[in-house]
């Protein structure tokens, strides 16, 4: 005959929880609860998550799996890791692109879009930090180029060109008048 309820489950091993009348063992990650156990300390009936769904944790109550997220092509996202029964799709940016968060307080679950990385070479600058979690950090002008305004300008190839002070210092020319 049924005994009295205990606030905790007196079952051997961990991960038992009272579901209805009985303390039941939960379902492992990647499985959903089809039916609770039908006897004390019993195993629940658990089924594997169908394709394109997942459950990342052991659970007692999920009667369906969560739908895998689709990476947002409009935001230039790609799947870095495909969805499995135990983990959601991991979306990110393809090589040469970086994550630009769409909210100020950025966390791993925040919405984002992918931006093409700055090509320091095309700007005639040294690459100081490679692009990954943030945009490329470009450094000083490459040899044969000098700082002029916001950009790098090629050293003159003849004495006919004007070579301001900064040019002369970098390019080895004396200032021409």
């Amino acid at each position: 005959q049924g005994g009295t309820r205990s606030p905790r489950c007196d079952c051997a091993g961990d991960f038992h929880k009272k579901i209805g009348l009985f303390c039941c063992r939960g379902c492992p990650a990647g499985h959903y609860l089809k039916a609770p156990c039908t006897e004390p300390c019993g195993n629940s009936t658990c089924l594997v998550c169908p394709q394109d769904t997942f459950l990342a944790w052991e659970n007692h109550h999920n009667s369906e799996c969560a739908r895998c997220q689709a990476c947002d092509e409009q935001a230039s996202q790609v799947a870095l890791e495909n969805c499995s029964a135990v983990a959601d799709t991991r979306c990110g940016c393809k090589p040469g692109w970086f994550v630009e968060c769409q909210v100020s307080q950025c966390v791993s679950s925040s919405p984002f879009y992918c931006q093409p990385c700055l090509d320091c070479g095309a700007l005639h600058r040294h690459t100081r930090l490679l692009c990954s979690r943030r945009d490329t950090d470009c450094g000083t002008c490459l040899p044969g180029f000098y700082e002029h305004g916001d950009g790098c300008v090629s050293c003159p190839t003849s004495t006919l060109g004007s070579c301001p002070e900064r040019c002369a210092a970098v390019c080895g020319w004396r200032q021409m008048f």
Partner: antibody
Framework: EVQLVESGGGSVQPGGSLRLSCAAS????????MNWIRQAPGKGLEWITY????????YYADSVKGRFTISRDNAKNSLYLQMNSLRAEDTAVYYC?????????WGQGTLVTVSS | DIVMTQSPSSLSASVGDRVTITCQAS??????LSWYQQKPGKAPKLLIN???NLETGVPSRFSGSGSGTDFTFTISSLQPEDIATYYC?????????FGQGTRLEIK
């Protein structure tokens, strides 16, 4: 669609026996605990017995213990209630129901009348 | 055995009224409580489990609340088809026990 259909009810004299059946369909019968609940005419609901999915665990209300036996045949998707030493107070509609706590699905019931 | 005391045993209300039924357990049953609706000549139908979880397909005008020993069942706006007898049931401890029922009528 989940369906539970009781049968085997009828009239019987006090001290007599009766065997009720419940045919289940539309779900994996072998995964669920099953119950019999009864309702005397004009009265409330009374849970009387439960059986685990494998049939290894059974529980009874004091009012029927020693007289009634619950059993199941998972190969036939069937639940049974063997009722012996019947009394006038056992007169009721008998329902089978699925679940190990909340009774999610019920049959339509079968009437058992115990009278001399 | 856990005794479930339901009140009122009967009540009369008008269409559109808010209707409340209470159920009290003789000992703490956490939230292991269900509510059923039974129409004349029919089997009971599960409306709410775990004190407040509405079953799939049950209209949202039905709701449940409470934990421990005191529970409430509410119909926010009574409809003609809600005329029935309502039962609470505990499944915290065997034997499973029901309240005596509340018969709901239209004024």
């Amino acid at each position: 669609e989940v369906q539970l259909v009781e049968s085997g009810g009828g009239s019987v004299q006090p001290g007599g026996s009766l065997r009720l059946s419940c045919a289940a369909s539309g779900f994996t019968f072998s995964s669920y605990g099953m119950n019999w609940i009864r309702q005397a005419p004009g009265k409330g609901l009374e849970w009387i017995t439960y059986i685990s999915s494998s049939g290894g665990h059974t529980y009874y209300a004091d009012s029927v213990k020693g007289r009634f036996t619950i059993s199941r045949d998972n190969a036939k998707n069937s639940l049974y209630l063997q009722m012996n030493s019947l009394r006038a107070e056992d007169t009721a509609v008998y329902y089978c129901a699925r679940g190990q706590g909340p009774f999610e699905y019920w049959g339509q019931g079968t009437l058992v009348t115990v009278s001399s | 055995d856990i005794v479930m005391t339901q009140s009122p045993s009967s009540l009369s209300a008008s269409v559109g009224d808010r209707v409340t039924i209470t159920c009290q357990a003789s000992q703490d049953i956490t939230n292991y409580l269900s509510w059923y609706q039974q129409k004349p000549g029919k089997a009971p139908k599960l409306l709410i489990n775990d004190a407040s979880n509405l079953e799939t397909g049950v209209p949202s005008r039905f709701s449940g609340s409470g934990s421990g020993t005191d529970f409430t069942f509410t119909i926010s706006s009574l409809q003609p088809e809600d005329i029935a007898t309502y039962y609470c049931q505990q499944y915290d401890t065997l034997p499973i026990t029901f309240g005596q029922g509340t018969r709901l009528e239209i004024k």
